[in-house]
Interface confidence: low
């Protein structure tokens, strides 16, 4: 029942065009040129895609034609390597196209930036967009691909064409609509939300595989599979597994034709096949493909069998544990995670592994041991502990938001975690602890059966942000250690790091808390970021300071805002007062 | 619920022609997966032909190769199978089917589920 096993194709080209249509072709082709190369204009990307195209068109029409046969990274490689301003834009990125496949393609992944000097996206006028909608749809559609792109390079391709579709329905409807802000302002903020978000959590999947492997990548699917498919079987869960691997294994190596093509096949297998895998399959399996996709990943947990058994009886009171673990050791945690998990929708991902992992290790050592099951027969024992650390994590934290609130409670997880791990660029600090800080507002209103996967596998997304940020730019020792030594430890690893002792207290600078006028035209998220980045640069400068310290300078801050904001002459008001707060905070924190 | 409508089935000697239509109906046809099958007396239906509506290429089996041609137009929904150099062992009953998934995978699937389907047009070629 394998979905993906397939006849040789004498033309990959010609197959995945035909398998696509030319429409999804030329999306995905310029989505992975964006992500490959992310300072190109996006002129230059729709003539390399354009080129393509009519290349792969050759080669439908006659598969023996001249280069159909070569495999799509030599193809999409070489066109590459024809742009002109390689070594000036992009410096040693342009050493890749000395190398051969399948070196070059890795060299151009490893070049990959996850934080690329471009230009924030400033959104238009909506009169200015629907323009621009209406004067040349696809090329409108083309730039949204291209602008997400080359600024998420790992962003799940597939699924950048299911955004894509919901932002050309968004313009088409609200184009046409009266009070046209009203319609399009809200949609696109929640593209923008739910990009980032999908973004994110894509990128985990990708460090998942390429820093831990293929291994690490499916005991994660295994374990949310199970949860989300309870009643499915182990042997349908491991392919499932098996499938869902291969296609994230793709898009993440730039492989997104086949990743498309492969997904598409998954999302159809899973739909002929729902009586055996779930009953809440039905509404996704009526949709669009790029609906259906998107709906199947996001689907609600089936309900538990009833009646399951304990899991005492296969894992710890059965004398065959030790022969059925040696026959087979990952078959056999597989189905330990696969049963724990099916049975614990109330536990993250990241808990089951942990659980799973400390059960690992309990077996290799006991089934050394001289009795082996006296040895393992407490190891459901060891499991407290570790599920009872996120509990009281979470507890705590949601009741602190509660208090306080997004805003605040992000501020206190900006002071904590500067506190740690101080060496890493405000920026960063700000962006990650204002990520960490939306856990509470999107999890804390769970009942407590769905709190914890919301929030710990939603914190593990969040710190692989912090992971990925902090390898371009290596600053802290701890935050390595955190981000390399364990994928699932990871929370646990930076809830545990206490006051960074060894950090040097930064230089003031009074430049660092200058205000102008332009503050009081921003919109109220971005007001908070200044503010956000100045409580950073405080806590840098003075890392022993008190919450009641810092809260006092902050509630400075923010009157002194307000304040000049109302005044007639603003630019002289936030120079003068700007000057006096300075002066007023360096004395509270005794600077 | 998708509906499809076939028509254009007949009665031809052997090295005529029949063009075959089948239109779509209740769902958005733009990125569906269209099929011809065909059942002889006895035997199991075998895909004919598919193309991807999104795009312009179609697959077609070995048997028909250079003889059938797919084609669709997406204004009317509808798309036609032109049979052409026609043989006694064309015959059968054509149905046609659709499947709203991404792109046509004959390599892949060939057999594959499609989850919707006309109440067939018959052809008859004699010789």
């Known amino acids: 029942r394998g979905v993906f096993r397939r006849d040789a194709h004498k033309s990959e080209v010609a197959h995945r065009f035909k398998d696509l249509g030319e429409e999804n072709f030329k999306a995905l082709v310029l989505i992975a040129f964006a992500q490959y190369l992310q300072q190109c204009p996006f002129e230059d990307h729709v003539k390399l895609v354009n080129e393509v195209t009519e290349f792969a068109k050759t080669c439908v029409a006659d598969e023996s034609a001249e280069n159909c046969d070569k495999s799509l990274h030599t193809l999409f490689g070489d066109k590459l390597c024809t742009v002109a301003t390689l070594r000036e834009t992009y410096g040693e990125m342009a050493d890749c196209c000395a190398k051969q496949e399948p070196e070059r393609n890795e060299c151009f992944l490893q070049h990959k930036d996850d934080n690329p000097n471009l230009p924030r996206l400033v959104r238009p006028e909506v009169d200015v967009m629907c323009t621009a909608f209406h004067d040349n749809e696809e090329t409108f559609l083309k730039k949204y691909l291209y602008e997400i792109a080359r600024r998420h390079p790992y962003f799940y391709a597939p699924e950048l064409l299911f955004f894509a579709k919901r932002y050309k329905a968004a313009f088409t409807e609200c184009c046409q609509a009266a009070d046209k802000a009203a319609c399009l302002l809200p949609k696109l903020d929640e593209l923008r939300d739910e990009g980032k978000a999908s973004s994110a959590k894509q990128r985990l999947k990708c460090a998942s595989l390429q820093k831990f492997g293929e291994r690490a990548f499916k005991a994660w699917a295994v374990a949310r599979l199970s949860q989300r498919f309870p009643k499915a079987e182990f042997a349908e869960v491991s392919k499932l597994v098996t499938d869902l691997t291969k296609v994230h294994t793709e898009c993440c190596h730039g492989d997104l034709l086949e990743c498309a093509d492969d997904r598409a096949d998954l999302a159809k297998y899973i739909c002929e096949n729902q009586d055996s895998i779930s009953s809440k399959l039905k509404e996704c399996c009526e949709k669009p493909l790029l609906e259906k996709s998107h709906c199947i990943a996001e689907v609600e947990n089936d309900e538990m069998p009833a009646d399951l058994p304990s899991l005492a009886a296969d894992f710890v009171e059965s004398k065959d544990v030790c022969k059925n673990y040696a026959e087979a050791k990952d078959v056999f945690l597989g189905m330990f995670l696969y049963e724990y998990a099916r049975r614990h929708p109330d536990y993250s991902v990241v808990l089951l592994l942990r659980l799973a992992k400390t059960y690992e290790t309990t077996l290799e050592k006991c089934c050394a041991a001289a009795d082996p099951h006296e040895c393992y027969a407490k190891v459901f024992d060891e499991f407290k502990p570790l599920v009872e650390e996120p509990q009281n994590l979470i507890k705590q934290n949601c009741e602190l938001f509660e208090q306080l609130g997004e805003y605040k409670f992000q501020n206190a997880l900006l002071v904590r975690y500067t506190k740690k791990v101080p060496q890493v660029s405000t920026p960063t600090l700000v962006e990650v602890s204002r990520n960490l800080g939306k856990v509470g507002s999107k999890c804390c209103k769970h009942p407590e059966a769905k709190r914890m996967p919301c929030a710990e596998d939603y914190l593990s997304v969040v710190l692989n942000q912090l992971c990925v940020l902090h390898e371009k730019t290596p600053v802290s020792d701890r935050v390595t250690k955190c981000c390399t030594e364990s994928l699932v430890n990871r929370r646990p690893c930076f809830s545990a790091l206490e006051v960074d002792e060894t950090y040097v207290p930064k230089e003031f600078n009074a430049e660092t808390f200058t205000f102008h006028a332009d503050i009081c035209t921003l919109s109220e998220k971005e007001r908070q970021i200044k503010k956000q980045t100045a409580l950073v640069e405080l806590v840098k400068h003075k890392p022993k300071a008190t919450k009641e310290q810092l809260k006092a300078v902050m509630d400075d801050f923010a009157a002194f805002v307000e304040k000049c904001c109302k005044a007639d002459d603003k630019e002289t008001c936030f120079a003068e007062e700007g000057k006096k707060l300075v002066a007023a905070s360096q004395a509270a924190l005794g600077l | 619920q998708v509906q499809l409508q076939e028509s254009g089935g007949g009665s031809v000697q052997a090295g005529g022609s029949l063009r075959l239509a089948c239109a779509a109906s209740g769902y958005t046809y733009s990125s569906a997966c269209m099929a011809w099958f065909r059942q002889a007396p006895g035997k199991e239906r075998e895909k004919v032909a598919t193309i991807y509506t999104g795009g312009t290429y179609p697959y077609y089996a070995d048997s028909v190769k250079g003889r059938f041609t797919m084609s669709h137009d997406n204004a009317k929904n509808t798309v036609y199978l032109q049979m052409n150099s026609l043989k006694p062992e064309d015959t059968g009953m054509y149905y046609c089917?659709?499947?709203?998934?991404?792109?046509?995978?004959?390599?892949?699937?060939?057999?594959?589920?499609?989850?919707?389907w006309g109440q067939g047009t018959q052809v008859t070629v004699s010789s």
């Open positions: 089917a659709a499947d709203a998934s991404w792109g046509c995978r004959l390599s892949g699937s060939w057999g594959a589920k499609y989850n919707n």
